[in-house]
């Protein structure tokens, strides 16, 4: 069973509110404590910035997408790149910044009236956590346009954070994805683990709110590495 992962006890001893989410600025989601996630500390100070390797868009921040840094570059080396603003060239929706989508190779506003019907989004992903079988496949996801016109409230299902209302992000909950609150100052957050520390991420949290970052709580510096408590703190 997945007792250690799915048990409500996994994150129930943390300070409220826990229905929400936590993490660090710019990242879409982070794992609940005790639940490993193949992430990394990608958001560092500018003078210490390092490209963050990724396998898929979901591993990058809400304002980023996952791709090879050079045109026609090695497909095996992908990093999180800054999203493309309106009127910039694109190949898929994830390349465009929140509030935009990719139409005819150009990022356009999703608020425009001509955004009707259904968008066909093709994403190729390689998957890992099967717990019995490992397989990779391509999937074509049909997104209904109504998701872009009516923003999801807390608890609503979503595909990405742009589907959720202001102050919410799209994060995994059990086996689905729902809109959860972005964390406020003092709320518990979770730093992504280093790449390679793979685990099943069942309860994701959002990132810390604007002007906040996920850092070790001062009185927890003495604690062992594994039990350090992180909270959203002012920069």
């Amino acid at each position: 069973t997945l007792n250690s992962v799915l048990n409500s006890n996994a994150i129930k001893n943390l300070p409220p509110p826990l229905g929400g989410a936590a993490g660090h600025p710019g990242s879409a989601v982070s794992a609940a404590p005790g639940i490993l996630y193949p992430g990394g500390n990608k958001y560092q100070t500018i003078d210490n910035y390092q490209p963050y390797p990724c396998a898929e868009d979901e591993e990058c921040g809400t304002d980023e997408y996952c791709a090879s840094p050079t045109r026609g570059g090695d497909a095996g080396v992908q990093i999180c790149l800054a999203c493309r603003k309106r009127r910039k060239r694109c190949m898929r929706h994830a390349m465009c910044c929140p509030g935009n989508y990719c139409k005819n190779g150009i990022c356009v506003s999703s608020d425009q009236n001509n955004f009707r019907g259904e968008i066909e989004e093709t994403i190729t992903e390689s998957f890992g956590n099967d717990h019995s079988t490992l397989d990779g496949y391509s999937r074509r996801t049909t997104l209904s346009s109504k998701m872009y016109h009516s923003k999801g409230q807390e608890g609503s299902v979503c595909l990405r954070s742009s589907d959720c209302a202001t102050g919410l992000c799209c994060a995994r909950h059990f086996w689905s994805k729902i809109c959860k609150p972005v964390l406020k100052e003092g709320q518990v957050c979770t730093k992504h683990r280093r790449k390679g520390s793979h685990g099943l991420e069942i309860f994701q949290r959002c990132y810390c709110g604007e002007g906040l970052s996920c850092r070790i709580q001062k009185d927890h510096h003495q604690a062992s590495n594994s039990s350090r408590l992180h909270t959203c703190q002012r920069h």
Epitope: N3, S8, G19, W175
Partner: antibody, heavy 117, light 112 residues
Framework: QVQLVESGGGVVQPGRSLRLSCAAS????????MHWVRQAPGKGLGWVAV????????YYADSVKGRFTISRDNSKNTLYLQMNSLRAEDTAVYYC??????????WGQGTTVTVSS | DIVMTQSPLSLSVTPGQPASISCKSS???????????LYWYLQKPGQPPQLLIY???NRFSGVPDRFSGSGSGTDFTLKISRVEAEDVGVYYC?????????FGQGTKVEIK
């Protein structure tokens, strides 16, 4: 209209294979995890398997591990259960169910699988 | 796995009289999101299970208000204020806080 429709059941000999399908409609299928649940004749309900919204995570009941494979095609709004090396004890009505994260949703009518020589 | 234990396993009720079914889980079903992932289903003869109550006490759409759910943590109860002939069948409690989802053994309700 929000609904789930299972199909693909039938009579099959022990050791053979069968593939069940579950067609979903009326909701954003690709945002939800999906489950298979079964019920043997005259018995209670038993959970079989789950797949995450994007197909990246799967988990199985011990009784079917290594024999059954759950998968999904989000472009077709369809959930699958590939059942190999079937045994008599797999005889049951199989239901697909949506992950219970927001509004609850009823199950489908189920599809009957009979494993018999 | 979380074990769900229902009682009684069978219940014979006079129409118009109340009925109560208990369900106990081997560990808390209260999630850190504040929700308690406990459900009640009714399976009428020859039909698939139909959802009655979700998250302990919320009636699913179309379910008569004579059905009510209560409880918290590990102890839950389904009450039928006045049993009607159409309420016969097997009632199951189910938890979804953890996979595998697990079900109670079922309570068979019949009319006297």
């Amino acid at each position: 209209q929000v609904q789930l429709v299972e199909s693909g059941g039938g009579v099959v000999q022990p050791g053979r294979s069968l593939r069940l399908s579950c067609a979903a409609s009326g909701f954003t299928f690709s945002s939800y995890g999906m489950h298979w649940v079964r019920q043997a004749p005259g018995k209670g309900l038993g959970w079989v398997a789950v797949i995450s919204y994007d197909g990246s995570d799967k988990y199985y009941a011990d009784s079917v591990k290594g024999r059954f494979t759950i998968s999904r095609d989000n472009s077709k709004n369809t959930l699958y259960l590939q059942m190999n090396s079937l045994r008599a004890e797999d005889t049951a009505v199989y239901y697909c169910a949506r992950d219970l994260v927001d509004t609850a949703m009823p199950w489908g009518q189920g599809t009957t699988v009979t494993v018999s020589s | 796995d979380i074990v769900m234990t229902q009682s009684p396993l069978s219940l014979s009720v006079t129409p118009g009289q109340p009925a109560s079914i208990s369900c106990k889980s081997s560990q808390s079903l209260l999630h850190s999101d504040g929700k308690t992932y406990l459900y009640w289903y009714l399976q009428k003869p020859g039909q698939p299970p139909q959802l009655l109550i979700y998250e302990v006490s919320n009636r699913f759409s179309g379910v008569p208000d004579r059905f009510s759910g209560s409880g918290s943590g590990t102890d839950f109860t389904l009450k039928i204020s006045r049993v009607e002939a159409e309420d016969v069948g097997v009632y199951y409690c189910m938890q979804s806080i953890q996979v595998p989802w697990t079900f109670g053994q079922g309570t068979k309700v019949e009319i006297k």
